[in-house]
Amino acid sequence: ALDTNYCFSSTEKNCCVRQLYIDFRKDLGWKWIHEPKGYHANFCLGPCPYIWSLDTQYSKVLALYNQHNPGASAAPCCVPQALEPLPIVYYVGRKPKVEQLSNMIVRSCKCS
Amino acid sequence: ALDTNYCFSSTEKNCCVRQLYIDFRKDLGWKWIHEPKGYHANFCLGPCPYIWSLDTQYSKVLALYNQHNPGASAAPCCVPQALEPLPIVYYVGRKPKVEQLSNMIVRSCKCS
């Protein structure tokens, strides 16, 4: 699987999950999130050659097409597969609220 | 929706479904498919700016991050959303077989 366990411990050039830390204040301008100050969001990057973690029959066909037509602009793309939530603390007036922001952290990628 | 109805009738630069015809023999080297000779597979292409058909909370955050950090390599990618099957005819010995190949035709795209 193209997950953090494999991708973070390898020098994989093909589609894999990469490390990305987002600072809520600096990167998004979000001052309203009290905790955490930022989080390891990660992102997906890398080419999707034939057979490399392809998502559907279509992505297999497209990767094969791309292999035979290397100049083509049609190719599968490396995108999130497994996403996890992020618990945050923010304030409504003076009252702290804890909420899970769904689908915020990339754990693995796929070629789609 | 970034579907064939909208995308094929517009000059949309952002993520949209684009026309692509795949000839099974010429483009894939597949001689075994008797009918059809090829099909309109289509593909997804175009940038994914903030708010543009974003798939998850993560893709919104990533698009926002990318908007504030334009040099970053982390950005959502335009990939298939709705896929349709393709009926094909192939031979097993001298006996024709009809089969639906699932997820073969792109009908719409999203930013993931």
Epitope: W30, K31 | I51
Partner: nanobody, 118 residues
């Protein structure tokens, strides 16, 4: 339900100025990402400017001419448009992206027409 209401559009001569306002529901405004978008006839809606907390970003076509600002006390985001050009003619829409709470989601205003013509 989050309300988003734009105002301030109108007819202006090339080189002139306009200020658009967008009021959003007080309950979510402080953590909403507020964006201005525009749609010219026969074209797709495009991003003009975003105010994300204390960070702003602009489309290349309006950089140096348009300024987005927000007033948290009034739950309003403004778009100051200077040195207007005929190609700025469009319907301008305000968008509120609410990332948290029961009202989380995307909300759009009805739009306000801006026409730049002599």
């Amino acid at each position: 339900e989050v309300q988003v209401v734009e105002s301030g559009g109108g007819l202006v001569q090339p080189g002139g100025s306009l200020r658009l306002s967008c009021a959003a529901s007080a309950s979510v405004f402080s953590w909403s990402v507020m964006g201005w978008f525009r749609q010219a006839p026969g074209k797709q809606r495009e991003l003009v400017a975003i105010s994300s907390g204390d960070r702003e970003t602009y489309a290349d076509s309006v950089k140096g001419r348009f300024t987005i600002s927000r007033d948290n006390a009034k739950n309003t985001v403004y778009l100051q448009m200077d040195t207007l050009k005929p190609e700025d003619t469009a319907v301008y829409f305000c968008n509120a992206y609410v990332p948290v709470g029961e009202s989380r989601g995307d909300y759009w205003g009805q739009g306000t027409q801006v026409t730049v013509s002599s």
